[in-house]
């Protein structure tokens, strides 16, 4: 059912570097999982190239990826999630390069959302909360989160805090007074599943209060 490349095309193809990377997202759309692959070399001519996954699937032997500009994508319920699948780059019926991958080891969680920071005057601290869609999932439920914050003027001076819950307390005395801060959070699988950091959540910006001279405490905004 597939077309065949002409010999010249294949000879050219064999000279190229077809190394690729993939990540999976489980229960990303209801009960559907997704798998996204892309070539590591952005200059690869992808015109006749297709991706295919075979093995460790439910009721099918293989699945074809859809091409979305530079990325290749599958959304399906048919990942078995036990054992390794073989992912191949193909020209027609010929495989150019393949990788055996367990989809549970290349999981990229969805980005956290609803990040917010509330100042507690009496406690002299900031309560950071955020949400994650993974609390409702059957598979990738347990995540490690990386909260990163910086003073807005310090371009690359991020402070990172790792936590497993979705709530963090920042002590006021650890922050500069009367300063604008940027904070963001990302997640990575932390139990059974392995993989990659999610995208960062949208940043949240908050200002620390001024120091109240009489008590040495910061003023709330």
């Amino acid at each position: 059912e597939s077309g065949y490349a002409q010999n010249g095309d294949l000879e050219d193809a064999e000279l190229d570097d077809y190394s690729f990377s993939c990540y999976s997202q489980l229960e990303v759309n209801g009960s559907q999982h997704s798998l996204t692959c892309a070539f590591e070399d952005p200059d690869v001519n992808i015109t006749n190239l297709e991706f295919e996954i075979c093995g460790a699937l439910v009721e099918v032997k293989c699945l074809n990826f859809r091409k979305l500009q530079e990325i290749y994508f599958i959304e399906t319920k048919k990942f078995l999630l036990i054992g390794k699948s073989n992912i191949c780059v193909k020209v027609g019926e010929k495989s150019l390069t393949c990788k055996k991958i367990d989809l549970t080891t290349i999981v990229k969680p969805e980005a956290p959302f609803d990040l917010s920071v509330v100042y507690r005057e009496g406690a002299n601290d900031f309560v950071v909360t955020f949400n994650t869609s993974h609390l409702q999932k059957k598979y990738v439920k347990v995540l490690m989160h990386d909260v990163a914050y910086r003073q807005e003027k310090d371009e690359n001076k991020w402070t990172h805090v790792n936590l497993s819950s979705t709530k963090l307390t920042l002590l006021q005395r650890k922050l500069q007074p009367a300063a604008m801060y940027e904070i963001k959070v990302r997640s990575i699988p932390d139990h059974y599943f392995k993989g990659f950091w999610s995208e960062w959540s949208p940043s949240y910006y908050f200002r620390t209060p001024e120091i109240n001279n009489s008590s040495g405490e910061m003023d709330p905004i």
Partner: antibody, heavy 117, light 107 residues
Framework: EVQLQQSGAELVKPGASVKLSCTVS????????IHWVKQRPEQGLEWIGR????????KYDPKFQGKATLTADTSSNTAYLQLSSLTSEDTAVYYC??????????WGQGTTLTVSS | ETTVTQSPASLSMAMGEKVTIRCMTS??????MNWYQQKPGEPPKLLIS???TLRPGVPSRFSSSGYSTDFFFTIEYMLSEDVADYFC?????????FGAGTKLELR
């Protein structure tokens, strides 16, 4: 070239059994699922079941459980459908079909089974 | 089990007319709907596979659309060679289930 070659027409008596064959070429039967579909004259298509020849794992539509038995012989690249306790309701064309991807792509030419005394 | 309801049962169309067939499913099957053409004495032929993907060699006048539970198959303009039975098949879950078919005739 992918082909599924089915055995010839059968005329059998009620109560008897019959075994239909489907020999594939152009691919390894272990790399596919083989599905079986029933089509009665002027009626729709009915899914009977499927076999994974690599593992002999089978699944049946509950309607055909006990009526149909699916087997495969990987050495001859052949799948079989056995139908038992035949009645006139089993008179139909039976197709074997390949499923590699998320669709049934190549179909055999069909075997006509007539159950009559 | 996912029930597939296909309509209409028959259609009589003039040459060049647009043909539309609908299949509805009793459960959400995402985009796992396939469309087949069958001519007398022949096995079914796959025209469009899941994800509304036109199979190689199938004329571009054939197309499909739909997602979840509601699916449409279209022949943009009817030709005499399109006289046949058409049916849909869901491959989302077992047992696989077919639509009852649409007999397309030339008026």
């Amino acid at each position: 070239e992918v082909q599924l070659q089915q055995s010839g027409a059968e005329l059998v008596k009620p109560g008897a059994s019959v075994k239909l064959s489907c020999t594939v070429s152009g691919f390894n039967i272990k790399d596919t699922y083989i599905h079986w579909v029933k089509q009665r004259p002027e009626q729709g298509l009915e899914w009977i079941g499927r076999i994974d020849p690599a593992s002999d794992d089978t699944k049946y539509d509950p309607k055909f459980q006990g009526k149909a038995t699916l087997t495969a012989d990987t050495s001859s690249n052949t799948a079989y459908l056995q139908l038992s306790s035949l009645t006139s309701e089993d008179t139909a064309v039976y197709y074997c079909v390949r499923r590699v991807y998320d669709y049934l792509d190549y179909w055999g030419q069909g075997t006509t089974l007539t159950v009559s005394s | 089990e996912t029930t597939v309801t296909q309509s209409p049962a028959s259609l009589s169309m003039a040459m060049g007319e647009k043909v539309t067939i609908r299949c509805m499913t009793s459960t959400d099957i995402n985009d796992d709907m396939n469309w087949y053409q069958q001519k007398p004495g022949e096995p079914p032929k796959l025209l469009i596979s899941e994800g509304n993907t036109l199979r190689p060699g199938v004329p571009s006048r054939f197309s499909s659309s739909g997602y979840s539970t509601d699916f449409f198959f279209t022949i943009e303009y009817m030709l005499s060679e399109d006289v046949a039975d058409y049916f849909c098949l869901q491959t989302d879950n077992l047992p696989l289930t077919f639509g009852a078919g649409t007999k397309l005739e030339l008026r």
